[in-house]
């Protein structure tokens, strides 16, 4: 079980307690109810870039 406050997942993915594995955040627009999508919303996606220096 995943320890609180830690994330073993690479950028662009998030831990699913329902599946006990990292899941791709790219699937969240299609199915936002998934438990791991909360973790995806907490951090910008891998391709996110600031619009200022």
């Amino acid at each position: 079980e995943q320890a609180p406050g830690t994330s073993p997942c690479s950028s662009g993915s998030s831990w699913s307690a329902d599946l006990d594995k990292c899941m791709d955040c790219a699937s969240c627009p299609a199915r936002p109810h998934s438990d791991f999508c909360l973790g995806c919303a907490a951090a910008p996606p891998a391709h996110f870039r600031l619009l200022w220096p």
């Epitope: 307690a17 006990d20 998934s34």
Partner: antibody
Framework: EVQLLESGGGLVQPGGSLRLSCAAS????????MIWVRQAPGKGLEWVSY????????HYADSVKGRFTISRDNSKNTLYLQMNSLRAEDTAVYYC?????????????WGQGTLVTVSS | DIQMTQSPSSLSASVGDRVTITCRAS??????LNWYQQKPGKAPKLLIY???SLQSGVPSRFSGSGSGTDFTLTISSLQPEDFATYYC??????????FGQGTKVEIK
């Protein structure tokens, strides 16, 4: 060959308890999410409960929340459903089923079912 | 909760007939729709997953289509062993899944 074998059903009085078991064989049990589904006599299928592969995450239908508890023992390849405060409307055949291997989108193997009858 | 409504509730058909069963969701579920077959006294059997993917070992006369709210299960040429009850199931809100009420396919 993948097999799921339920047991523990029977006749129980309203307010009573039962513990159902689902013994898995023919596959590695621990990576798979599992569910219980029930079917009242002559009726359709109703999802009851879900448990994650490790057992750390569980979910319940509103109709059983607070009365039923799902659990699993991966060392024994067994899924359980503890049913308390049983009501007449809980009378049904109870099936365990295995979730798909990438997500829990579908349920590819089911047990034969065990009948629970709640009656005085 | 997402409600799944199947139609018809029952139908009579003959061996060799083409049979179509529809399933409608109360809101869009994308393609997260599965179909099961159940015979009396037996457990459900997965036929189609994710709207159109045929489960391994299921005859090719079974096919599924649709997306959003409207889905179809088609049996291209009904065989004697196909007389059963068919259920759709949405997994858009997994693990909180819901089933349709079932469609019973009977012999005419």
């Amino acid at each position: 060959e993948v097999q799921l074998l339920e047991s523990g059903g029977g006749l129980v009085q309203p307010g009573g308890s039962l513990r159902l078991s689902c013994a898995a064989s023919g596959f590695t049990f621990s990576p798979y999410p599992m569910i219980w589904v029930r079917q009242a006599p002559g009726k359709g299928l109703e999802w009851v409960s879900y448990i994650s592969p490790s057992g750390g995450s569980t979910h319940y239908a509103d109709s059983v929340k607070g009365r039923f508890t799902i659990s699993r023992d991966n060392s024994k390849n067994t899924l359980y459903l503890q049913m308390n405060s049983l009501r007449a409307e809980d009378t049904a055949v109870y099936y365990c089923a295995r979730g798909g291997d990438t997500y829990f989108d579908y349920f590819d193997y089911w047990g034969q079912g065990t009948l629970v009858t709640v009656s005085s | 909760d997402i409600q799944m409504t199947q139609s018809p509730s029952s139908l009579s058909a003959s061996v060799g007939d083409r049979v179509t069963i529809t399933c409608r969701a109360s809101q869009s579920i994308s393609g997260y729709l599965n179909w099961y077959q159940q015979k009396p006294g037996k457990a459900p059997k997965l036929l189609i997953y994710q709207a159109s993917s045929l489960q391994s070992g299921v005859p090719s006369r079974f096919s599924g289509s649709g997306s959003g709210t409207d889905f179809t299960l088609t049996i291209s040429s009904l065989q004697p062993e196909d007389f059963a009850t068919y259920y759709c199931q949405q997994s858009y809100t997994s693990p909180f899944i819901t089933f349709g009420q079932g469609t019973k396919v009977e012999i005419k």
